[in-house]
C-alpha cells in the first residue's frame, strides 16, 4: 500500500515530492548563514541564532516553534587570565610558553569572541612536574605503562595524543593513574593526512591548530548539577563537589607546534613499540621527565577556566500528525559550536533547516504526515549533550509513551567518500530500502543507487552484498533517547575512507579552521554529499512518520542478538578454567535469543497478514514495534551508570564514542584476570548474564500475540 493512503491526501504528496523539494543550493546558503560568527553555547550569539531558527521554521510552515530554556553548568576560559603551559627552569622561570590561541583563518581576522582552545570543565590549577607521554591515554596504554614498563604516573603531568577514543576517557584514565595534569595534543600522524595541504590550502590541521572539547565523564547524566531531572527554574542543584562527571585535575589542549617543544626534550624510557610513535621529529620517549641536559626543567600548567551556570536554548518545532498525533518522530541536531562550526554542527543544522523547509512546503500544499514530527535544534551539545538531555528529562514521560524514533543530525560530513550509518537494528531494513531508492552522488557511480556505492565502498563484514551499519555509541544527542529512554534511533553522514585515512575524525575538528570555506572549497563544493545526507535523514523521518506500518524489522534484532551472544561467549571462553570453577553458563542467554528469534519470526508473519484497515489492530501492531526498543531498557541501569539503561547497547566504558554490545557482561569480564577477588568478579559475570537473558526474553514476549 502507498504510505499516503491513511492520510487521505493526493498521491503527489509522497516521499518523492519531499525528496525533490530538497535543494543543494539551499543547504549551501543555510550553511553560510550559520557559520559567519561563533555560536558558543551560552552566548548571546547562539541565543540570537536560536531566535532566527525559530522565526524561519515558523515561516517554513511548522505548526508551532518554541524555545525551551535550561540553566546548566558550562565552562569558559578566563578572558583576562589565559590558560597556557610552560617549561620552567630550575629557578622557576618560564623558558617556553604554549600559544594562547590559534592564528585566525583568512577573512576572520577581525571576528570577536573566538574562544581560545581549552578543555571544557577543567578545574583550575597550576600543577608542575615531570612529563610522561602516554600515547592515546587509552586503557591499554596505561596497562602497557604501568604493568609492562613499570612506569608510575602518580604525581606526573601526562601528555596524550588526541584520537582513537573520546577525550573524557583519556582524562579519566589519567586521573585513575594518579596524574596531576593532562596535556592533550593533535599529532600529525592522526590529524595530518599525507599529500594534503594544511588549511587554508587544504583540509589538514596547521601546527597552530588546536582541538577544543569537553572532558566530562557524564555517562548520560546531562547537566552535571541536576542528574535525572531538568535544569529548570525550580531545580535543586548539587554542590560543585557532588557534580556528576567533572574532572579532578587540570587539562589543556595544544597543537603540534607546541607539542614538539614539550616532546623533543623527553627522556626516560623509549617508546615500547612503533604504535607509540607519531609523526613529529621527536623520539617519543615516555619519560618520566626530560633528558640529561634538561632534566632540571619541569612542565607547568596554568589553568584558570571557570564553571558557570548559564542559560541555554533549544528550538523545538512541531508538525502535527494527521492520524496519530500522539506518536512522535524526532529529527534533532545541535546548533552550538566551538567556533564557526563549519562542519560540526552547522553542516548538519543546514540539512535540518532544508528538511524542515521541504516538509513545510508540503504542509502548505495541504499535506500532513501520519504521525507528529518534532524538529529540534539542540544547545550545549559540545558541553556534554546538555540541551537534548535536559529536554528529554523534562519530557521523559511523554517520550517513553509516544516516542517512535529519533534521527540525529549533527555533522553531515566527516569526509566525502561514502555513507556511514549507525542505528538500531530495527532500522536496518528502512535504511537499506531507502538507499536503494536514492541516487549515489559518488564519482564513478553515476546512475547507480546510493545503496550500491555504499555497499561497494563500505561492505558489511558479515553479510556479502550489504553495507556496513554500525552500533550506536554516544558522543552525540541521540544518547538520551536511545541509551536512557529506549527510543529507536539512527544517524547518517558522509565519511572518509577509513582504509586509507587512519587519522581520527577529520583533521580540523573543533578548531578555528572549521569554516564555511573548508566545506565549500575542499569537502563538498557542489553540496551533493550534503544533499544526499539530507535525503537519507529526511527520507528516514518521512517513512517513520508516514508509513502505515512502522518500517521496523524485529528479525534484524534477532540476528544481531545472536551475533552479540556469540561474541561475548567467546570472550568469556578465554577463561575456560574459571568458567568451570564458578559454574558460568551462557545457556540462559542463548535460550532467550533463540526464543526471541522464533517469536520475532512469527510476529513478522503476522505483520504481513493482518488487516491494515482495522485501526485498532494496526495501532496494536505498531505499538509492539514501537515498544520493542523500550523493552531492552533496564530501569536500574548498568552498574555505576544509571543513565545507561539499554541492556543490548551502551557506550564503551573505555571510549564513549564506541558502542558495546551486552555491555553489562562485557564490563564484568573486562580485565577479570586482574581482579583481587575472582569469586566476586565471576559472580558479577553470572549476574550480568542473568540480567541480559531476562531482558532478551522479556523483550521477546512483547512481540508475542497479545492474548
Amino acid at each position: 500500500k502507498s504510505s499516503n493512503e491513511a492520510t487521505n491526501i493526493t498521491p503527489k504528496h509522497n516521499m518523492k515530492a519531499f525528496l525533490d523539494e530538497l535543494k543543494a543550493e539551499n543547504i549551501k546558503k543555510f550553511l553560510y548563514n550559520f557559520t559567519q560568527i561563533p555560536h558558543l553555547a551560552g552566548t548571546e550569539q547562539n541565543f540570537q541564532l536560536a531566535k532566527q531558527i525559530q522565526s524561519q521554521w515558523k515561516e517554513f510552515g511548522l505548526d508551532s516553534v518554541e524555545l525551551a530554556h535550561y540553566d546548566v553548568l558550562l565552562s569558559y576560559p578566563n578572558k583576562t587570565h589565559p590558560n597556557y603551559i610552560s617549561i620552567i627552569n630550575e629557578d622557576g622561570n618560564e623558558i617556553f610558553n604554549t600559544s594562547l590561541f590559534e592564528p585566525p583563518p583568512p577573512g576572520y581576522e577581525n571576528v570577536s569572541d573566538i574562544v581560545p582552545p581549552f578543555s571544557a570543565f577543567s578545574p583550575q590549577g597550576m600543577p608542575e612536574g615531570d612529563l610522561v607521554y602516554v600515547n592515546y591515554a587509552r586503557t591499554e596504554d596505561f596497562f602497557k605503562l604501568e604493568r609492562d614498563m613499570k612506569i608510575n604516573c602518580s604525581g606526573k603531568i601526562v601528555i596524550a595524543r588526541y584520537g582513537k577514543v573520546f577525550r573524557g576517557n583519556k582524562v579519566k584514565n589519567a586521573q585513575l593513574a594518579g596524574a596531576k595534569g593532562v596535556i592533550l595534543y593533535s599529532d600529525p600522524a592522526d590529524y595530518f593526512a599525507p599529500g594534503v595541504k594544511s588549511y587554508p590550502d587544504g583540509w589538514n590541521l596547521p601546527g597552530g591548530g588546536v582541538q577544543r572539547g569537553n572532558i566530562l565523564n557524564l555517562n548520560g547524566a546531562g547537566d552535571p548539577l541536576t542528574p535525572g531531572y531538568p535544569a529548570n527554574e525550580y531545580a535543586y542543584r548539587r554542590g560543585i563537589a557532588e557534580a556528576v562527571g567533572l574532572p579532578s585535575i587540570p587539562v589543556h589542549p595544544i597543537g603540534y607546534y607546541d607539542a614538539q617543544k614539550l616532546l623533543e626534550k623527553m627522556g626516560g624510557s623509549a617508546p615500547p613499540d612503533s604504535s607509540w610513535r607519531g609523526s613529529l621529529k621527536v623520539p617519543y620517549n615516555v619519560g618520566p621527565g626530560f633528558t640529561g641536559n634538561f632534566s632540571t626543567q619541569k612542565v607547568k600548567m596554568h589553568i584558570h577556566s571557570t564553571n558557570e551556570v548559564t542559560r541555554i536554548y533549544n528550538v523545538i518545532g512541531t508538525l502535527r500528525g494527521a492520524v496519530e498525533p500522539d506518536r512522535y518522530v524526532i529529527l534533532g541536531g545541535h546548533r552550538d559550536s566551538w567556533v564557526f562550526g563549519g562542519i560540526d554542527p552547522q553542516s548538519g543544522a543546514a540539512v535540518v533547516h532544508e528538511i524542515v523547509r521541504s516538509f513545510g512546503t508540503l504542509k502548505k500544499e495541504g499535506w500532513r504526515p501520519r504521525r507528529t514530527i518534532l524538529f529540534a535544534s539542540w544547545d550545549a551539545e559540545e558541553f556534554g549533550l546538555l540541551g537534548s538531555t535536559e529536554w528529554a528529562e523534562e519530557n521523559s514521560r511523554l517520550l517513553q509513551e509516544r516516542g517512535v524514533a529519533y534521527i540525529n543530525a549533527d555533522s553531515s560530513i566527516e569526509g566525502n567518500y561514502t555513507l556511514r550509518v549507525d542505528c538500531t537494528p530495527l532500522m536496518y531494513s528502512l535504511v537499506h530500502n531507502l538507499t536503494k531508492e536514492l541516487k549515489s552522488p559518488d564519482e564513478g557511480f553515476e546512475g547507480k543507487s546510493l545503496y550500491e556505492s555504499w555497499t561497494k565502498k563500505s561492505p558489511s563484514p558479515e553479510f556479502s552484498g550489504m553495507p556496513r551499519i554500525s552500533k550506536l555509541g554516544s558522543g552525540n544527542d541521540f544518547e538520551v533517547f536511545f541509551q536512557r529512554l529506549g527510543i529507536a534511533s539512527g544517524r547518517a553522514r558522509y565519511t572518509k575512507n577509513w582504509e586509507t585515512n587512519k587519522f581520527s575524525g577529520y583533521p580540523l575538528y573543533h578548531s578555528v579552521y572549521e569554516t564555511y570555506e573548508l566545506v565549500e572549497k575542499f569537502y563538498d563544493p557542489m553540496f551533493k554529499y550534503h544533499l544526499t545526507v539530507a535525503q537519507v535523514r529526511g527520507g528516514m523521518v518521512f517513512e517513520l512518520a508516514n508509513s502505515i506500518v512502522l518500517p521496523f524489522d524485529c528479525r534484524d534484532y534477532a540476528v544481531v542478538l545472536r551475533k552479540y551472544a556469540d561474541k561475548i561467549y567467546s570472550i568469556s571462553m578465554k577463561h575456560p578454567q574459571e568458567m568451570k570453577t564458578y559454574s558460568v553458563s551462557f545457556d540462559s542467554l542463548f535460550s532467550a535469543v533463540k526464543n526471541f528469534t522464533e517469536i520475532a519470526s512469527k510476529f513478522s508473519e503476522r505483520l504481513q497478514d493482518f488487516d491494515k484497515s482495522n485501526p485498532i489492530v494496526l495501532r496494536m501492531m505498531n505499538d509492539q514495534l514501537m515498544f520493542l526498543e523500550r523493552a531492552f531498557i533496564d530501569p536500574l541501569g548498568l552498574p555505576d551508570r544509571p543513565f545507561y539503561r539499554h541492556v543490548i547497547y551502551a557506550p564503551s566504558s573505555h571510549n564513549k564514542y564506541a558502542g558495546e554490545s551486552f555491555p553489562g557482561i562485557y564490563d564484568a569480564l573486562f580485565d577479570i584476570e586482574s581482579k583481587v577477588d575472582p569469586s566476586k568478579a565471576w559472580g558479577e559475570v553470572k549476574r550480568q548474564i542473568y540480567v541480559a537473558a531476562f531482558t532478551v526474553q522479556a523483550a521477546a514476549e512483547t512481540l508475542s500475540e497479545v492474548a
Epitope: 590561541f101 581576522e109 597552530g208 617543544k261
Partner: antibody
Framework: EVQLVESGGGLVQPGGSLRLSCAAS????????MAWVRQAPGKGLEWVAN????????YYLDSLKSRFTISRDNAKNSLYLQMNSLRAEDTAVYYC?????????????WGQGTTVTVSS | EIVLTQSPDFQSVTPKEKVTIQCSAS?????MYWYQQKPDQSPKPWIY???NLASGVPSRFSGSGSGTDYTLTINSLEAEDAATYYC?????????FGQGTKLEIK
C-alpha cells in the same frame, strides 16, 4: 644548496612599471608559499605580498593591492612581482623569501635582494 | 593591522653582557619570529615560533613570551652579535615587522 636570486630591479620614473623575478633552486618550489618583503633605504622590513603553493591565493599589504601583483610559475621555479604606477615611496630593496609555515608566514630563506629606485 | 613595537630602538652593549630585546604587539598574537640583519646583507631567520632557534644560531640566544609580549635574549653577548634584530608576527595579515633594534658592541 637552497638559493633565491632576484632580478629586474632598476631605476624607473614615477608612474612607471617594473617586473621583478626570483629564481629558486635547491628545493621543491611548489611545496612552499613564497613572499616579497621590501626595505626602504635606512628603514625596517615591510612585508609586501604572499602567494600560496599553486598561485590560487594571493595576499597583499592593503596599500599596495591595487598596484602590485604577485605570481608564480612552478614549472620554471620562478616568483614574480609586477609593480605598476610606481611612486617614490616604493623605492626599496625587494627581497624574495621562502615561507616555511605556509599561510602564516615565516621566512626561512631570503634572496640577496634587488634594488628598485623610483625617481624622476 | 597588528603593530609591533620593539624596545629599545638602539642598544650599546659590552661583550659578555646579557641582552634582552622586547617586542610588544598591539593585540595578542600566536607566535613571534625574529630575524637578524647585518649591514648590506639580507635578513637571516633567527628564532621561529617564539622560542625555536633557526639552524646555525648559537645557543646563547633564546626567545620567549606569549600573547602581546615577547622577548629575544642573548645570554652572553659576543662581537658577532652586533646587528639589527626584527620581530615579526605570525598571526594575521598583513604580516608585520617591528621597527628593529640595533645592537652595537661597546
Amino acid at each position: 644548496e637552497v638559493q633565491l636570486v632576484e632580478s629586474g630591479g632598476g631605476l624607473v620614473q614615477p608612474g612607471g612599471s617594473l617586473r621583478l623575478s626570483c629564481a629558486a633552486s635547491g628545493f621543491t618550489f611548489s611545496d612552499y608559499y613564497m613572499a616579497w618583503v621590501r626595505q626602504a633605504p635606512g628603514k625596517g622590513l615591510e612585508w609586501v605580498a604572499n602567494i600560496n603553493y599553486d598561485g590560487s591565493s594571493t595576499y597583499y599589504l592593503d596599500s599596495l593591492k591595487s598596484r602590485f601583483t604577485i605570481s608564480r610559475d612552478n614549472a620554471k621555479n620562478s616568483l614574480y612581482l609586477q609593480m605598476n604606477s610606481l611612486r617614490a615611496e616604493d623605492t626599496a630593496v625587494y627581497y624574495c623569501a621562502r615561507d616555511l609555515d605556509g599561510y602564516y608566514g615565516y621566512f626561512d630563506v631570503w634572496g640577496q635582494g634587488t634594488t628598485v629606485t623610483v625617481s624622476s | 593591522e597588528i603593530v609591533l613595537t620593539q624596545s629599545p630602538d638602539f642598544q650599546s652593549v659590552t661583550p659578555k653582557e646579557k641582552v634582552t630585546i622586547q617586542c610588544s604587539a598591539s593585540s595578542s598574537v600566536s607566535y613571534m619570529y625574529w630575524y637578524q640583519q647585518k649591514p648590506d646583507q639580507s635578513p637571516k631567520p633567527w628564532i621561529y615560533r617564539t622560542s625555536n632557534l633557526a639552524s646555525g644560531v648559537p645557543s646563547r640566544f633564546s626567545g620567549s613570551g606569549s600573547g602581546t609580549d615577547y622577548t629575544l635574549t642573548i645570554n652572553s653577548l659576543e662581537a658577532e652579535d652586533a646587528a639589527t634584530y626584527y620581530c615579526q608576527q605570525y598571526h594575521s595579515y598583513p604580516l608585520t615587522f617591528g621597527q628593529g633594534t640595533k645592537l652595537e658592541i661597546k
